[in-house]
Amino acid sequence: KAMHVAQPAVVLASSRGIASFVCEYASPGKATEVRVTVLRQADSQVTEVCAATYMMGNELTFLDDSICTGTSSGNQVNLTIQGLRAMDTGLYICKVELMYPPPYYLGIGNGTQIYVIDPEPCPDSD
């Protein structure tokens, strides 16, 4: 059976360039080790934004230099991407892999379109 991954269709980043969304997966088994990857798709090119492997019940830990942070609760991952600019507007896909125990399962979300609007510069004051 395929693993279903759900994520919101659209998210608007804050004026500070922060976007948050929930990635939820329907686990066919009792996974203890899960890897979550955020991918960006633009013009059919796919690139990795960030990735984290976590043990069920433990916190989700991205690398120190990652632009992502997140928390996990059961089969739900709350993802936050920071430092976004207008040029980063695009489709962000949540990919979930159940790494352990067997069998391995792959789940690919339909993607969240994140819109980023650069803030207008403050006008000079006299």
Partner: antibody, heavy 118, light 108 residues
Framework: QVQLVESGGGVVQPGRSLRLSCAAS????????MHWVRQAPGKGLEWVTF????????YYADSVKGRFTISRDNSKNTLYLEMNDLGTEDTAIYYC???????????WGQGTLVTVSS | EIVLTQSPGTLSLSPGERATLSCRAS???????LAWYQQKPGQAPRLLIY???SRATGIPDRFSGSGSGTDFTLTISRLEPEDFAVYYC?????????FGQGTKVEIK
């Protein structure tokens, strides 16, 4: 550009061992899971084994379980396949393949031929 | 284990004709997890289609994929001389990863 180059194939007697290598270049090796796939002469493709990003998780086809061991050295950008107790049914071209971001095997090596014969 | 059955085993066609290859799964495969590969003699397989219908980089638009659930199709709209090869479907949604037995497209 992405390149996968297998080596280590050859002729080996039944019951003996062989170690295959797959040298990867042109991409960040540690960011991808990897596979070995084999193809017996004149036959179709058979998935053999999978290894996770850090090498902690490994999966094997029933036909090789207990005899083959997959491993990787991310510092050397190299994938390995240790094959023990080889039988004539293991005669095949062995390909290493990279898992693409969305799951399919997007890049393959040219293959290395393993012939098990007495 | 998901078993993939391809049909026909061999397809004899002329250049310019349309080729329709079938892949049937023993249980439901999400369309996100079905791929098609092309293999020519003496060469490694090459990814053509992933996610049931997305073309891989550099693949001409005469190749198209369709289907969902247990039935998938690869269509080559107009066969070019270089398209005569063996085609494999594959599911990659769960272990063990499995391939169909292949369909050979040969010149009539």
């Amino acid at each position: 550009q992405v390149q996968l180059v297998e080596s280590g194939g050859g002729v080996v007697q039944p019951g003996r061992s062989l170690r295959l290598s797959c040298a990867a270049s042109g991409f960040t090796f540690s960011s991808y899971t990897m596979h070995w796939v084999r193809q017996a002469p004149g036959k179709g493709l058979e998935w053999v084994t999978f290894i996770s990003y850090d090498g902690n998780n490994k999966y094997y086809a029933d036909s090789v379980k207990g005899r083959f061991t997959i491993s990787r050295d991310n510092s050397k950008n190299t994938l390995y396949l240790e094959m023990n107790d080889l039988g004539t049914e293991d005669t095949a071209i062995y390909y290493c393949a990279r898992t693409g971001w969305l799951g399919p095997f997007d890049y393959w090596g040219q293959g290395t031929l393993v012939t098990v014969s007495s | 284990e998901i078993v993939l059955t391809q049909s026909p085993g061999t397809l004899s066609l002329s250049p310019g004709e349309r080729a329709t290859l079938s892949c049937r799964a023993s249980q439901s495969v999400g369309s996100s997890y079905l791929a098609w590969y092309q293999q020519k003699p003496g060469q490694a397989p090459r990814l053509l289609i992933y996610g049931a219908f997305s073309r891989a980089t550099g693949i001409p638009d005469r190749f198209s994929g369709s289907g969902s659930g247990t039935d998938f199709t690869l269509t080559i709209s107009r066969l070019e001389p270089e398209d005569f090869a063996v085609y494999y479907c594959q599911q990659y949604g769960s272990s063990p990863w499995t391939f169909g037995q292949g369909t050979k497209v040969e010149i009539k």
